[in-house]
Interface confidence: low
């Protein structure tokens, strides 16, 4: 049950059997506590006072590694190591594609300890932003035959786990590509910044009028973009160009981390876009090309002096990383 969180973990890819059952779990915000010390985790579970209570936390000793902390019938807190690798999560040799799936599996399908399942999620005292995000301050071209990924200045990444020596396994939000990047070329993104920043279709800094102008000038028929709603902070608007006009659709986040549009629920705005690429958004029209963020919108100022960083890592040109 109890694990040592101090082990060094690393590795690019796993071939374990994946658990692929439709599993339901409570929303992330009811059980995910972010980076949390083991002692405090035990305190929170004991305060909850019910056997079968659980939470998931990021190990404070090993960033990128997670721990499932569980209060057993014996009133003992057990800590189970969860290894996050390349977007998958491993516990006891089983692979899950999300922490929610893992929770669902040990809530409904299998026992965590003999005769004991996950019963009661323990919510954090305050909301947690669970995924670290970074932004490229310089462009980079991958070294051939490695797990690295190429990227552009301004690309945003979700950090899945931090590997040894300053490398990170990430997803590029613009391209959805997963791979290795090195920390020298990225900067932290503030928690207050919109989580969709970096998606090719997201325009966080433009007005409603600029959205219309972009669709009419840069865009074509069936082009689209998403921007934050003016009327309701926290909501989004999907702007879509038809032959006649620009149509606007409201997207509302829900308390359990889903998004609602047109009475239907989706796991992400990306899923909404994928849906309406295949299904008509208005009669005779499908979403086609997003209008990408324009140069003048770049939130990064272009005065970042990359010379020192590139010298440090021996970058000769933008397109050939190593000598």
């Amino acid at each position: 049950g109890t694990v040592d969180e101090g082990d060094s973990l690393d590795g690019p890819e796993y071939e374990e059997e994946e658990v692929a059952i439709p599993l339901t779990a409570p929303p992330t915000n009811q059980w995910y506590h972010g980076k949390l010390d083991r002692t405090i985790a035990e305190e929170r579970l004991r305060q909850a006072g019910k056997s079968g209570s659980y939470l998931i936390r990021e190990s404070d000793r090993r960033p990128g590694s997670f721990v499932l902390s569980f209060l057993s019938q014996m009133n003992v807190v057990n800590h189970f190591r969860i290894i996050a690798m390349c977007g998958d999560y491993y516990i006891g040799g089983r692979r899950f594609s999300s922490l929610s799936d893992l929770i669902g599996y040990y809530s409904h399908v299998s026992c965590l300890l003999k005769g004991e399942k996950l019963l009661y999620p323990v919510a954090p005292p305050e909301p947690v932003e669970d995924r670290r995000r970074v932004r490229a301050i310089l462009p980079y071209t991958k070294v051939p035959d490695t797990d690295e990924i190429s990227f552009l200045k301004g690309d945003m990444f979700i950090v899945h786990n931090e590997l040894e020596d300053g490398w990170m396994w990430v997803t590029n939000l613009r391209t959805d590509e997963q791979g290795l990047i090195v920390e020298d070329l990225v900067e932290e993104v503030g928690r207050e910044e919109d989580p969709h920043e970096g998606k090719i279709w997201f325009h966080g800094k433009i007005s409603k009028q600029e959205a219309y102008n972009l669709l009419m000038t840069v865009g074509q028929v069936c082009s689209f973009l998403v921007r934050p709603s003016d009327n309701t902070p926290g909501d989004y608007s999907l702007y879509f160009r038809t032959n006649e006009n620009i149509q606007r659709f409201k997207i509302c986040p829900t308390p359990n981390n889903q998004f609602m549009m047109g009475g239907r629920y989706y796991n992400s705005i990306g899923d909404i876009i994928d849906h309406y690429r295949k299904e008509q958004i208005v009669e005779g029209y499908y979403l086609k090309e997003p209008v990408p963020m324009q140069d003048q919108e770049q939130v990064l100022n272009d005065t970042v002096d990359g010379k020192e960083i590139y010298n440090t890592i021996r970058r000769k040109t933008k397109d050939a990383f190593y000598k």
């Epitope: 690019p12 300053g166 440090t312 000598k323």
Partner: antibody, heavy 117, light 107 residues
Framework: QVQLQESGPGLGQPAQSISITCTVS????????VHWVRQSPGKGLEWLGV???????DYNAAFMSRLSITKDNSKSQVFFKLNSLQPDDTAMYYC???????????WGQGTTVTVSS | DIELTQSPASLSASVGETVTMTCRAS??????LAWYQQKQGKSPQLLVY???KPGNGVPSRFSGSGSGTQFSLKINSLQPEDLGNYYC?????????FGGGTKLETK
Amino acid sequence: QVQLQESGPGLGQPAQSISITCTVSGFSLSSYGVHWVRQSPGKGLEWLGVIWRGGGTDYNAAFMSRLSITKDNSKSQVFFKLNSLQPDDTAMYYCAKRGGPGYFDVWGQGTTVTVSS
Amino acid sequence: DIELTQSPASLSASVGETVTMTCRASENIYSNLAWYQQKQGKSPQLLVYAATKPGNGVPSRFSGSGSGTQFSLKINSLQPEDLGNYYCLHFYGTPYRFGGGTKLETK
């Protein structure tokens, strides 16, 4: 093209120390870590330690008290020093570049160290 | 510390045969395993990393499989130049450790 080249005195005295330099080209020491591995005559491979790209080190516990690995990024050199030599330290010593997460993708050609009085 | 056990310690095969060698880890190392070939008097060369991924320029007759604690390296259609020693390496956190090796000879 990535290359690593070890150079050292070849001969060491018992109880003395030996220093080996690994000179690298084709990549930067501030981007990739360098590991050290040795192979005693007729034996297998033994991992000794690593200097990570940020300058931190990890050593095989068996060598912790007498091994030191340092580097000079600007000269593209890694320095390996093993103290309190014993005859069973006689081996071929290799430096190797860290590939992706973990494994070594390119090795030096090795340098022979013989410990003898 | 994690131990790696390779078997067999030596094997003899004819040109054109398929040979398989195994590496067992003392605990779950997921796919954090690499295979190396070492010819007499030469440095080791990377064959496979992450248990199944071929190294750069490695002939397609070499393939790795397995995860967790059991791993295999298979050589299809053995060539004369394949003789030498083969080592597995775990990189599931330091200290890294090599297996004892498999000596491959041709009949």
